[in-house]
Each structure stands twice: as structure tokens, then as C-alpha cells.
Amino acid sequence: GSERTCCPVNWVEHERSCYWFSRSGKAWADADNYCRLEDAHLVVVTSWEEQKFVQHHIGPVNTWMGLHDQNGPWKWVDGTDYETGFKNWRPEQPDDWYGHGLGGGEDCAHFTDDGRWNDDVCQRPYRWVCETELDKASQEPPLL
């Protein structure tokens, strides 16, 4: 594929990445799939500056990011190392709370109304943010 040089329509560029901010809600897995179909991934927050950028655009609304622990340890969807990476959890989070009565714990991370992170039930229909890197090759076939 060819290397993407600018962001698609309705996506916002920041520091060589493109971001798309949903205005509706989906379960985490559906949001994850939506981004993949757009040749992107749920947003992976790697710095305080990126956190501030995303937070400014989503406002005080619960919003999924590309971080989960559905298979045990916390993992970013693009393979970015969780342990050494940026974190912005709310105090006492993540807590894998079972008291919600929906079965199981809390395996998916989201931005809360103040921007800090919380783990929650992955089935909740929250907004989401997709991200794709400008410097990566797109999956679209080259124009003939």
C-alpha cells in the first residue's frame, strides 16, 4: 500500500497521527472493530500531550480507548508496552470491580468525565476515538 500523507476527511491531525471522534456509543469490541475497518485502531495514549489533545476533543464524556485486560495483563491494542508507558488512572483504579451486577469484572479502559482513566464493563455503550499513524502504509491499493 501507499504511505498516507494526510488525514482522511473528518479526522483531526496531531503529531503525525490522525484521530476520529465518535458522537455515538458502542460496546468496546464494536468500537474496536469499527476502528479496524477504518484501517485504524482505538486510541493509544503514549504521552501527556496526547492525553491533553484527546481530552480537549472529547470533553467530559466517558470514551473508550485502546486499552484492555481481557486476557489477563493490561494491553494496548497496537502493542505499545503498558508497563513502561503513559498512564493516567483515577485514584484507586483500575479496580476490576465486580459489584456492578453485570457479570464479570471490568476489563476495558475509558476516559472519564475529567479525562483520567477508569476500567469498566466492556459492554457499556461509550463513545470512542480511533487513531491511525500518518507514516504507516495504508491498506488501500495504490491508484493506477
Epitope: 513502561t84 493516567n88 475529567d114 479525562g115
Partner: antibody
Framework: QVQLVQSGAEVKKPGASVKVSCKAS????????MHWVRQAPGQGLEWMGW????????NYAQTFQGRVTMTRDTSISTVYMELSRLRSDDTAVYYC??????????????WGQGTLVTVSS | DIQMTQSPSSLSASVGDRVSITCRAS??????LAWFQQKPGKAPKSLIF???SLQSGVPSKFSGSGSGTDFTLTISSLQPEDFATYYC?????????FGPGTKVDIK
Amino acid sequence: QVQLVQSGAEVKKPGASVKVSCKASGYTFTGYYMHWVRQAPGQGLEWMGWIHPNNGGTNYAQTFQGRVTMTRDTSISTVYMELSRLRSDDTAVYYCARDPVVVPAAPFDYWGQGTLVTVSS
Amino acid sequence: DIQMTQSPSSLSASVGDRVSITCRASQGISKYLAWFQQKPGKAPKSLIFAASSLQSGVPSKFSGSGSGTDFTLTISSLQPEDFATYYCQQYNSFPFTFGPGTKVDIK
């Protein structure tokens, strides 16, 4: 012009608490996080945490977790840093510094003048 | 936590000299590095942010470079008012951390 004016020097006994204020003027208060940084005599700089002026969210360095509380009063454009259970090694100059909510912009561009907190029995 | 180291820890230089200070992060921090100047009894003053962007009002004799783990602050022609301690700071990840400082004094 932008100013961050901090409260005056304090002398406290071990085990006591201290509350330092930082009054902002010359800019939109809610447009900037406020960080607190301290510097022990003759030592380097140590980041303590931040407070979001709009929603009051905080993030504290692990070192200070459980001892520090940052609050704000938007009506008077002032943030506060309270440190409890003071020890002699908390003797330091405490600074506030602002950091823009919206990027890209320069973080830590303005600092308060500093508040010396002395902990001594 | 990300450790920041600076070298040298101190240096003696003359007015007019070109001076460079290096800062190294224990892991990659992209370009999220700032440089500060501090004089005795004063608050730190911001010189450089985002590794190479000059803070508003700071003279162009100060410049910064680097990305990832290795960064440099350069003063192209040292003036009497530049004798101070210089700190680097990473603001990529919490907790934000500072280097131990480099003291620049008169030879």
C-alpha cells in the same frame, strides 16, 4: 501580565500540616493545569502533581500519595497545595507552575515565586 | 519512573564561549523535554519546550535538540547573565522528572 503569586513562608513542627496558595492573574485560570514542584535546600527539582482548574481532577506523584491534597477555588483563581504529616525532609521551597489544557503550547512557562516551608521541632 | 541524567554536573566557561549540556532519559520520551534556567533564590525560568522550541521571550542564543532519549541544550555565546544552573525535565509520562542540574560558572 501573567502572574502566579504564592503565599508567604511557613515554619511548621513535624507531624503538622501546611497549606500553600498560588493566586493566578493575567490569563484564563481554567485554561491551565497547575503543577506543584518542590526544591529542598541545595537540591534539585521534584514534581509533586497537578490539579485541573476546571474539574478539580488531580494526579499526585506516588511519593506524596496520601499526604498531599491539591484543591482550587475558581472564584478567586487560586490553587492550594496541602501537605500533611510533615517531616524534616519536607523542608523545601514549593513552587506552582502552569501548564496549558490545550496543546500544542508551552508547558511550565510561568512559575510562582516559591514558598519556603521549614519543618523544625 | 523515568530517570533523567545530565552531564556535566558542572562546568566552568568564559564569556563568549559556546556551551553544550546533555540530558539523557532512561527510556524514550519522544520530544517531550523542557529546559529550565535557575539562579540562586529564584524560581526556574523556562527556556525550551518540546526539545527544540524556544519559549517566548527567550533569546535565540539558547537552542535545544534531540529526540527519544538524548537531548542537548546549547548556549551559542555565553553572557554574564547566563551563569546559572540548568535543568532538563521530561513531561512525557507521570511522574514528571527533572535532571539533577548542571551548574555553569565563570572560569
